[in-house]
Interface confidence: medium
């Protein structure tokens, strides 16, 4: 005898009622009399509900079961399951006989959506841009288990310092918990989804934190106005410092060093102590200073890279912050200076003079002049390269026609440093070469 | 009319870098991040990084860390992508797009046209 | 890295068949995005977060799935869909894309 039965499993929401589906094709002549059938669960063979002897016998299963009696002899052995639970999930075997014997087993799958994501965020009250705070994702009475996801305001996602935990309650639906931990910058969203894998159903809850700005009457924080210039290869002292009233002590501290654009940690001292540095190893506090209110960090080895804006951030009981800006700078080498021709020339014929400078920072600014001082403006081309250490090579080309005699020269200027290389070449009215010979 | 217009052609050297631009016109540029994607010759799409041109933030993909820089300028809405130390498998066309959306779903809505870089000796 | 792998690399279809391009990830994602890329052109959006069409897209493309399992499906194929397939994710870094299927009309 064929039984038929879907082969996908029934999805059912909690609470609802479920149709387990199941059919048989009854022979011509066929009466109620002469069959047998019986739903029972696949794993356990419990019975759940069962028609023999002409009759219906009833739910054995909680009293929540019942048969489509109407259908029965159109070959429906189709059973309903009311008020589902997360308990009922499981195979349902449907056993039909007549003069023949047939079954197969229907999955029941359980679902529940999740609700809206409540956020709480931990601390919530003054905040600051640098504070570590929880933001907790709570999702209630879903089934079966949820994933969750969080993302910043921008869809980037959030993997690191996230703690998820999803507990059943007596009616085994789960409430999920997802706690975010995070170092807050100037503001920022977070996003979290709650998804169920079931129902392919996403709840999702977000939350926007805005820092207060220091207020005045504050930690008074100070830095220099001007940006701190440094060489490239040697180390910087960013300069910053607080007031700290009388019997204060480091205990009391958090300070906190970051990048003011990416808000990417530099380096920090916290519950007492220094907790290191987060950029490459090459910072460092001057800790014998601190309780005096000496929060400058020290940067070793000076990059290129390292140039833009460091906001030091002092917490004690109130909260202060200023940013500090780093210029890096290299100077530029002595420009060398090559001709092309470089031989036979006289008055008359076009020539181009480049003036050659390696390995400055920031980009330079070119000058050229002739042998009395006056600018040469027309006719020239200056490219700068950066190499991989981010320093520039400047190449500045002078396409000139020769006079009788004439001096040209180049100059090199680092607007940083306010550091000029110069660099001539002069060119006599007889048939020469360049460089002169011996 | 939203658009990214990237800047024309490159053939380079081994062992140099390219710095690609893309013109973003028809939107408030700060409002949304661009992310540049490769592709090298008859094979699939590659995640370079992304820039937000408000914050200025960057994240690469770590494949390409040391060697590729993104930049934005605001004045000019455009963004930039360089990638230093060429070789000759970075032979791809290089394509900037914007990530749309809303949270907590985000996509590629609008591409560049592309920009074919040829590393070669 | 969520490495996204699509099946199948190839599939040669003729005019009005169904066609099904599955995209399996090495772990869960929170959604899924697809885009067409046509010879010569720049990939353009197609389905946006699993199941919903992006804007001008015809109605015979629909996307479902999720966890690590989706799938886009192409109801009566027409000519102008002869084109290469991605699946993209961006729940956990870096951001990833399917290796592609490039689909050829008969």
């Known amino acids: 005898l064929e039984v038929q039965v879907p082969e996908d499993p029934v999805v059912a929401l909690v609470g609802t009622d479920a149709t387990l589906r199941c059919s048989f094709s009854p022979e011509p002549g066929f009466s109620l009399a002469q069959l047998n059938l019986i739903w029972q669960l696949t794993d356990t063979k419990q019975l759940v509900h069962s028609f023999t002897e002409g009759r219906d016998q009833g739910s054995a299963y909680a009293n929540r079961t019942a048969l489509f009696l109407d259908l029965l002899a159109q070959g429906n052995a189709s059973l309903r399951l009311q008020r589902v639970r997360v308990a009922d999930e499981g195979s349902f075997t449907c056993f039909v006989s007549i003069r023949d014997f047939g079954s197969a087993a229907v999955s029941l799958q359980v679902a529940a959506p999740y609700s809206k994501p409540s956020m709480t965020l931990e601390p919530n009250k003054d905040l600051r841009p640098g504070d570590t705070v929880t933001i907790t994702c709570s999702s209630y009475r879903g089934y079966p288990e949820a994933e969750v996801f969080w993302q910043d305001g921008q869809g980037a996602p959030l993997t690191g310092n996230v703690t998820t935990s999803q507990m059943a309650n007596e009616q085994g639906l789960f409430d999920v918990h997802s706690v975010l931990r995070v170092v807050l910058g100037a503001n920022g969203t977070y996003s979290c989804l709650v998804r169920n894998p079931v129902l392919q159903q996403d709840a999702h809850g977000s939350i926007t934190i805005t820092p207060q700005r220091s207020p005045t009457g504050a930690v008074e924080v100070q830095v220099p106005e001007d940006p701190v210039v440094a060489l490239v290869g040697t180390d910087a002292t960013l300069r910053c410092s607080f007031s700290p009233e009388p019997g204060f002590s480091l205990a009391q501290l958090n300070l906190i060093w970051q990048l003011t654009d990416t808000k990417q940690l530099v380096h920090s001292f916290t519950e007492g102590r220094d907790q290191g540095s987060a950029y490459a190893n090459r910072t460092a506090l001057f800790l014998d200073l601190l309780a005096q209110g000496n929060a400058s960090l020290r940067l070793q080895r000076v990059r290129v890279a390292d140039e833009g804006s460091f906001t030091c951030f002092v917490s004690i009981r109130d909260f202060g912050s200023a940013a500090v800006s780093l210029q890096v700078a290299a100077p530029y080498s002595k420009p060398s200076m090559t001709l092309e021709p470089n031989k036979d020339l006289r008055p008359g014929d076009t020539v181009t003079i480049t003036c050659s400078s390696y390995r400055g920072y920031p980009e330079a600014e070119v000058f050229w002049q002739d042998g009395q001082g006056a600018p040469l403006t027309g006719n020239v081309t200056t490219s700068q390269m950066a190499n991989e250490q981010g320093l520039f090579d400047v190449h500045s080309v002078l396409r000139v026609v020769l006079g009788a005699n004439g001096t040209y020269s180049c100059l090199v200027r680092n607007p940083v440093l306010q550091q000029d290389a110069h660099g001539s070449v002069t060119i006599t009215g007889q048939p020469m070469t360049f460089p002169p010979e011996a | 009319e939203v658009q990214l217009v990237q800047s024309g052609a490159e053939v380079k050297k081994p062992g140099s870098s390219v710095k690609v631009s893309c013109k973003a016109s028809g939107y408030s540029f700060t409002s949304y991040t661009i992310h540049w994607v490769r592709q090298a010759p008859g094979q699939g799409l590659e995640w370079m990084g992304y820039i937000n041109p408000n914050s200025r933030n960057t994240d690469y993909n770590q494949k390409f860390k040391d060697r590729v820089t993104i930049t934005a300028d605001k004045s000019t809405s455009t963004a930039y992508m360089e990638l230093s130390s060429l070789r000759s498998e970075d032979t791809a066309v290089y394509y900037c797009?914007?990530?749309?959306?809303?949270?907590?779903?985000?996509?590629?809505?609008?591409w560049g046209q592309g920009t074919t870089v040829t590393v070669s000796s | 890295e969520i490495v996204l792998t699509q099946s199948p690399d190839f599939q040669s279809v003729t005019p009005k068949e169904k066609v099904t391009i599955t995209c399996r990830a090495s772990s869960s994602v929170s959604y899924m995005n697809w885009y067409q890329q046509k010879p010569d052109q720049s990939p353009k959006l197609l389905i946006k977060a699993t199941s919903n069409l992006a804007s001008g897209v015809p109605s015979r493309f629909s996307g479902s799935g999720s966890g690590t399992d989706f799938t886009l499906t192409i109801n009566s194929l027409e000519a102008e869909d002869a084109a290469t397939y991605y699946c993209?994710?961006?729940?956990?870094?870096?951001?990833?894309f399917g290796q592609g299927t490039k689909l050829e009309i008969k």
């Open positions: 993209q994710q961006w729940s956990s870094n870096p951001l990833t």
């Open positions: 797009a914007r990530y749309s959306g809303s949270t907590p779903y985000w996509y590629f809505d609008v």
